[in-house]
Interface confidence: medium
Amino acid sequence: AAQPNNSLMLQTSKENHALASSSLCMDEKQITQNYSKVLAEVNTSWPVKMATNAVLCCPPIALRNLIIITWEIILRGQPSCTKAYRKETNETKETNCTDERITWVSRPDQNSDLQIRPVAITHDGYYRCIMVTPDGNFHRGYHLQVLVTPEVTLFQNRNRTAVCKAVAGKPAAQISWIPEGDCATKQEYWSNGTVTVKSTCHWEVHNVSTVTCHVSHLTGNKSLYIELLPVPGAKKSAKL
């Protein structure tokens, strides 16, 4: 699947319900500039943070030219959900759509976009809009990847040994240390698709007094440091 094109700007804004909103939709100026390009870009990979609101858009076809809009939603382990709208009779029809968080943005005769409010881990999947017009069918698909921010903790568990954990992240976080030590990393996979990464490091060199755990993740990076004490130190914890 193609990566998001730079012309499809990812807009993030704070709304008064305190959830960030993400959209790959374009304004009218962008529609005219990118019309042919967007129709060619059939599929877009789109990482979206859990608990935000997401808006997925159909191809930029004027609604006056529309006959039918269909959204197909394929989520892991569920039957395909279809939401359709027929302009002439102003009818909508849904099949196998049980998740009430996935809805039309407004009335489909006014806005063909689909919204997820809020995004949950179960919304990982493929979303496709098909617009039927007198000129043919136009498609736009999204491979939606739900990102979950891991909870990061750092603590000393034995003499000159520290443990850094990135708990329940999606995808798995990467852990690095400054300075480098003698490290072992384990990953624990959870049924909901999240991964806990645990890195345990030991420093023999006694002139190392402070160590930093750096956690890299698609939702953002986080660094925590700890002083290596002769006895186990206080536990540090942070969200990315």
Partner: antibody
Framework: EVQLQQSGAEFVRPGASVKLSCTTS????????IHWVKQRPEQGLEWIGR????????KYAPKFQDKATITADTSSNTAYLQLSRLTSEDTAVYYC???????????????WGQGTSVTVSS | DVQITQSPSYLAASPGETITINCRAS??????LAWYQEKPGKTNKLLIY???TLQSGIPSRFSGSGSVTDFTLTISSLEPEDFAMYYC?????????FGGGTKLEIK
Amino acid sequence: EVQLQQSGAEFVRPGASVKLSCTTSGFYIKDDYIHWVKQRPEQGLEWIGRIDPANGNTKYAPKFQDKATITADTSSNTAYLQLSRLTSEDTAVYYCARQLGLRRTWYSLDYWGQGTSVTVSS
Amino acid sequence: DVQITQSPSYLAASPGETITINCRASKSISKYLAWYQEKPGKTNKLLIYSGSTLQSGIPSRFSGSGSVTDFTLTISSLEPEDFAMYYCQQYNEYPWTFGGGTKLEIK
């Protein structure tokens, strides 16, 4: 194979009600729409209404709004037409038919039942 | 409601001939007109939808044309099994409405 099997002929008294059934096979009714059409003896076809079995939403022709009630049971793949306060004007053959719901093109009624004859007589 | 006027109401023809049946809508129905065949003892058959699209399994001697308000069903090289009742029907808006029907009989 797509089939719509309708219930048998009905002979009813004026003022009574009758409930006709349309059991489908070869497709899931919740994916489509089921329509009902009336045909009086030696006359043409009249559209009564339709149901979206997935959610129970119905639409009726104005003249049948107070006469007909369309329901569906997705577990048995069956649609129903209930006719109330029957008069001789309701003597007719009643057909159920399928309209494809979620397809790229909206079709009309692509499969029909064999019809149920309703005779209203005292 | 959209009124559908179908003509003629009766038509006599011989096998091998070509016939046309017309339907006129009281207002625009775009291309959303269907044609059906009704025969005693058989379930009604969809012949044409969207004005001109032949339904799967229907012989190519059946064809439909027209849009907006005026539509035509043409049956070329009539076969004995084509003698039946024919109805047009609009499905552009509710309530759906049918034409009065055309009875095609053998001359």
